[in-house]
């Protein structure tokens, strides 16, 4: 189960971003740092260090067009990607409790 301030790597990180960002999609780097041709901002922050809900949400794509860098669209994952986390390490109830606690 996901716990705040733990490392998230690989597929587990993608799954979690999908869940947090929903239909908005997400970036692997924030708009301001999209100069690198191979952006792995969130990988460095969440996998090699640790991250929480607030940090994860900064990588979600912004719904308002005017705030989005349209030159680099948010991630659109292939059809075979699960819409929500599928790993047995990820439990919806635990995530829900964590997000509610962090938002208080």
């Amino acid at each position: 189960a996901y716990r705040p301030s733990e490392t998230l790597c690989g597929g587990e990180l993608v799954d979690t971003l999908q869940f947090v960002c929903g239909d908005r999609g997400f970036y692997f780097s924030r708009p301001a740092s999209r100069v690198s041709r191979r952006s792995r901002g969130i990988v460095e922050e969440c996998c090699f260090r640790s991250c929480d809900l607030a940090l994860l949400e900064t990588y979600c794509a912004t719904p308002a067009k005017s705030e989005r860098d349209v030159s680099t669209p948010p991630t659109v994952l292939p059809d075979n990607f699960p819409r929500y986390p599928v790993g047995k390490f990820f439990q919806y109830d635990t995530w829900k409790q964590s997000t509610q606690r962090l938002r208080r």
Partner: antibody, heavy 122, light 107 residues
Amino acid sequence: EVQLLESGGGLVQPGGSLRLSCAASGFTFSVYDMNWVRQAPGKGLEWVSSISSSGGGTLYADSVKGRFTISRDNSKNTLYLQMNSLRAEDTAVYYCARDSDTSSYYWYYDLWGRGTLVTVSS
Amino acid sequence: DIQMTQSPSSLSASVGDRVTITCQASHDISNYLNWYQQKPGKAPKLLIYAASRLQSGVPSRFSGGGSGTDFSLTISSLQAEDFATYYCQQSYSFPRTFGQGTNLEIK
């Protein structure tokens, strides 16, 4: 040519230290996360350690945590593994491996060095 | 940690045979599964990533399948150069773990 070349292996006594190097060429080293993977004689593959592209983040297997230190020098296109307090069970061929570009949002080791043998014995 | 279990551990086959190696994960890893080939004295070589995607330059006789906890690597028609040890590896979470290997020998 795109390649990784390890060096620094050899025979060392238990409790001793060794520093492995991995020289990268033919690609932009500074934008790839890098890894060390080892293989004991006649055994399978075991992930040892990873370092982020900038060198700002590291991860270690429990079996080497506190004894091994991974680092990199992007100006020299070189990856390092400092191994201290070596044990007999650390005897293995050590490979450096490049992490995949995540444009596909998958992770895999797409480039490997030929390996360097570390033998820990008295 | 996620445990990866391969079967069989060893397999004897002939040139032209169709062979399948399986890999089971102790937890659901979606399709975050890679396959590597290793020949004696050589470094591993990536064959397949994301469970079924063929790495560039790998012959089409290699194919991968599966999702969740059960995966397979199939070689449709064995060639002499395919006799080697094959490893699966999960990339769902750290530590990235490998299967124990399947040694494919010539019959």
